[in-house]
């Protein structure tokens, strides 16, 4: 529990401290206070760097002091022989003695009290962006008129965030434009259009004047556009350095304007509008798109028709065409569907004949039926040659999809009859 | 076959053997057998065999047996109470529809049907081949296939021959243009047991082929002249019957 004051004594004080001890004390005063630690008695075996016996004062990771030997006060009106002032509310005191003492040493007596710290002046880093106000046990920040204190209770800024723009066209400017924008502010503007429309931002060079970058090229004040995982900027300087037309490919755009404490300029003004999301004209082999356009945008519907001999297979069913819609994400629906060569499948068997085994059963492939000669012949003509047609059928020039018919050859004996002379 | 020679089934791959009654037939396509009406009038479910030269029981077991689905007798064939006393063999033609198609090969293949043109009108002296397992000079039934080549003769030659064992007056026997008379040379003739077999004539338009000009029907006396059903006169009936009783697989 934090305390406002306390006493720390070496073991057995005021008797001699024992050999081989290590003891530590964790001092904690309330938040917002520092610690004043002072020693009124110090009698510890002296050694170089206090290597044998010592009392150590540690604040966080820093060693504030290491004491040994005998000390007496320099001031006859004060009993303090050594003192430490830390602007933190925690401190650790560690006492160590080694295995032997040449003489009898009585150790130390120390006291601590909680002291007020002036957060506004005692630290290198100023805690407030504008006005700092100290009080016992703490401080608070305050802001000039027109500014408000941010949630971090340290920084002041102007109220320039939270605007959401949903209209398909609009104009956005930095606070006070064309008067100088406020320092130390983060302005966030959100453009949220209907899905299927991309935000297009247009800026004129002369409508942009933001504190220039430092010598390392880092913008001190910056304008950034964020669309999903894509970022445009940061931009700064006199005259807009980016593209005058920014196609975000997104229906959602966040505009972030960040300023530091110094160097305010007139700021910026931009226009935006919503363009229907374009879909790229994809290369779909063996097909034609209807209607044919130079550019396709959100909600456009095309019929993709396969060329003769090609089909789109969906769920193991073949079709000659399919519809694709330009979606809100700039991608085509049914984009996985492709026109592939028609497969006529394994040719049917015929009675008393055979079909040569096809090397391929795809569009354009050719097969030949033959009859079991010399006992059968092809009755219905056509020559027996079939090709895989665009409709998925094996087709003959003469018979169409009708299969050849192998019928018996009649009236031909395998061996002629010879009368035996008697 | 009287006065014939031994033959091999490869000489007559269309030859069909009927075992009851002992007779013949001609295969005309995968599903149909052409025979004489008098062969099937008494047995509408005949057992038939193809592809074997010998009709020995052991050989038949290895040959192809044909199962009939239906027998179609020509509507002009007069059915009698006592077929043995028949004197009218007009329209002696029938078709047997098979249950299953016959697989063709060197020992089984059909004979052609005559065309309808005048090219297929027979002239006296035109030669035809007959084959069968019927009576020979030596035995009642042949075990191995016999065949003979004989000429077409004028119908009067058949009329002039005295019927050997008449069952009626000689004048009672009917002779019509639906019959072909053939034989009379070297005693070569068809006989009992050869009925229904083809009288095969060389196709006038394709010398490599034979067509069934006639079917062994009847005769006054074995070894003289014989009468054969004139198939040309029945081609329309044959085609119509086959068409009306075919399966889609044949169409």
């Amino acid at each position: 529990e934090p305390t406002m004051y306390g006493e720390i004594l070496s073991p057995n004080y005021p008797q001699a401290y024992p050999s081989e001890v290590e003891k530590s004390w964790d001092i904690e005063v309330p938040e917002g206070y520092g610690i004043h630690l002072y020693f009124t008695h110090l009698d510890i075996e002296l050694s170089e760097n206090c290597a044998y016996d010592s009392v150590q004062i540690i604040s966080g990771d820093t060693e504030e002091g290491r004491l040994c030997g005998q000390r007496s006060s320099n001031n006859p009106h004060s009993p303090i022989v050594e003192e430490f002032q830390v602007p933190y509310n925690k401190l650790q005191v560690i006492f160590k003695s080694d295995f032997s003492n040449e003489e009898r040493f009585t150790g130390f007596a120390a006291y601590y009290v909680a002291t007020d710290i002036n957060e506004c002046t005692d630290f290198v880093d100023v805690p407030c962006s504008h006005f700092c106000n100290n009080f016992i046990g703490g401080y608070f920040c305050s802001c000039p008129p027109e500014y408000f204190l941010h949630d971090d209770m340290k920084n002041c800024g102007v109220n320039c965030s939270g605007d959401v723009f949903t209209a398909l066209i609009g104009e956005i400017a930095s606070p006070n434009y064309p008067k100088p924008y406020p320092e130390n502010s983060r302005c966030e503007y959100q453009i949220r259009l209907e899905k299927g429309f991309q935000v297009v931002v247009t800026l004129r060079r002369e409508d942009f004047d933001v504190e220039a970058a430092d010598s390392a090229g880092n913008c001190l004040d910056s304008l950034v556009f964020v669309a999903g995982d894509r970022q445009f900027g940061p931009y700064c300087g006199h005259g807009f350095p980016g593209p005058l037309n920014i196609e975000t490919k997104s229906n959602a755009l966040d505009i972030i304007f960040q300023t530091d404490l110094t160097g305010q300029k007139k700021g910026w003004k931009l226009r935006y509008h919503g363009d229907p999301m374009p879909c790229p004209k994809e290369d779909t082999p063996n097909s034609v798109w209807e209607p044919a356009k130079a550019k396709y945008v959100f909600r456009d519907v095309v019929q993709i028709t396969c060329l003769d001999g090609f089909e789109v297979v969906e769920g193991r069913v073949g079709a000659t065409s399919f519809y694709s819609t330009c979606q809100s994400n700039g991608k085509w629906s049914n984009s996985k569907l492709k026109c592939q060569p028609v497969d006529c499948g394994i040719p049917e068997s015929i009675e008393n004949g055979k079909v040569e085994d096809p090397e391929s059963t795809l569009f354009g492939s050719v097969i030949r039926y033959t009859c079991e000669e010399p006992y059968y012949y092809m009755e219905n003509g056509g020559g027996g040659e079939y090709h895989c047609a665009g409709n998925g059928s094996w087709v003959n020039e003469v018979l169409g999809p009708e299969l050849p018919k192998c019928v018996p050859v009649c009236g031909v004996p395998r061996e002629p009859f010879e009368e035996k002379q008697r | 076959i009287i006065g014939g020679s031994d033959a091999d089934i490869k000489n007559f791959p269309w030859q069909v053997f009927f075992d009851n009654p002992w007779a013949g037939g001609a295969l005309i396509n995968e599903y149909w057998v052409l025979t004489a009406a008098h062969v099937v009038e008494g047995n509408r479910e005949p057992t038939m065999y193809v592809g074997s030269t010998s009709v020995q029981t052991s050989r038949l077991a290895k040959s192809k047996m044909l199962t009939p689905e239906h027998v179609f007798i020509h509507p002009g064939w007069k059915l009698l109470e006592v077929p043995e006393g028949r004197t009218n063999f007009d329209n002696d033609i029938a078709l047997v529809r098979l249950k299953d198609p016959v697989k063709m090969g060197p020992t089984v293949s059909p004979i052609c049907l005559p065309g309808t043109s005048s090219d297929y009108n027979l002239m006296d002296g035109d030669l035809g081949l007959i084959s069968g397992w019927g009576r020979t000079e030596k035995r009642d039934r042949a075990v191995r296939l016999k065949a003979a080549r004989l000429p077409v003769a004028p119908l009067r030659k058949c009329k002039e021959v005295k019927v050997e064992k008449p069952t009626a007056d000689a004048e009672a026997y009917v002779f019509t243009p639906n019959m072909i008379c053939a034989g009379g040379e070297k005693g070569m003739d068809s006989c009992k047991g050869d009925s229904g077999g083809a009288f095969a004539v060389q196709d006038p338009n394709d010398k490599t082929k034979f067509y069934a000009a006639g079917l062994v029907s009847w005769g006054p006396q074995c070894g003289t002249y014989g009468l054969y059903t004139r198939v040309k006169n029945y081609v329309d009936w044959i085609m119509k019957t086959m068409q009306e009783n075919s399966t889609p697989r044949e169409d």
């Epitope: 069913v317 394994i346 | 889609p248």
Partner: antibody
């Protein structure tokens, strides 16, 4: 007479392999495309694979595509089904069938039983 | 893939009655490639009707088939004791897979 006789079935553990054979007779085997069809106990028919007459073109059911291979040896008038990585759901009576007009299966074997169980 | 649905799953009728078995395809099937099979317990299936309406060899004329597009029917005009069996419809489509219906069991009432 057309005859198809399957063999090679039996009991096999999951992950195991079997090779089914189908001996054909009574027709010119090399003239016909052939198929394997299976029937799980008490269930309906399920097509498994098809092979063209010469064996160059095959189609297999998606669920067995990587595991089963249909093949044929026309010199031996025999159809085969090599089954690897067998699963319990492959348990069935496997029939071979001849494909005829319009890919109707006009002749079937009597079937061979494959049981996949640990 | 084309799914074939047969109805009813079981049909209970008496000999002499008329039987109507239905097969419905999930998408249009060519009537040339729609076939029916008969299967009796413990036996292999037999091709019964091919290309929608053609009776296979040995199938009695009391059987008939009809249909087009997605709806197909097998009809038995007057049931005989030997007709009680399971009937499967089957379609072939070049893109595969070949599919069968789940079967209709025709049983004696």
């Amino acid at each position: 007479e057309v005859m198809l006789v399957e063999s090679g079935g039996g009991l096999v553990k999951p992950g195991g392999s079997l090779r089914l054979s189908c001996a054909a007779s009574g027709f010119t085997f090399s003239n016909y495309a052939m198929s394997w069809v299976r029937q799980a106990p008490g269930k309906g028919l399920e097509w498994v694979a098809t092979i063209s007459s010469g064996g160059s073109k095959t189609y297999e059911l998606d669920s067995v595509d990587e595991r089963f291979t249909i093949s044929r040896d026309n010199s031996k008038d025999t159809l085969y089904l090599q089954m690897n990585s067998l699963r319990a759901e492959d348990t069935a009576l496997y029939y071979c069938a001849r494909l005829f007009t319009k890919h109707a299966m006009d002749y079937w074997g009597q079937g061979t039983l494959v049981t996949v169980s640990s | 893939q084309i799914v074939l649905t047969q109805s009813p799953a079981t049909l209970s009728l008496s000999p002499g009655e008329r039987a109507t078995l239905s097969c419905t395809a999930s998408s249009s099937v060519s009537s040339s490639y729609l076939h029916w099979y008969q299967q009796k317990p413990g036996k292999a299936p037999k091709l019964w009707i091919y290309s929608t309406s053609n009776l296979a060899s040995g199938v009695p004329s009391r059987f008939s088939g009809s249909g087009s597009g997605t709806d197909y029917t097998l009809t038995i005009s007057s049931l005989q004791p030997e007709d009680f069996a399971t009937y499967y419809c089957h379609q072939y489509y070049r893109l595969h897979p070949i599919t069968f219906g789940q079967g209709t069991k025709l049983e004696i009432k």
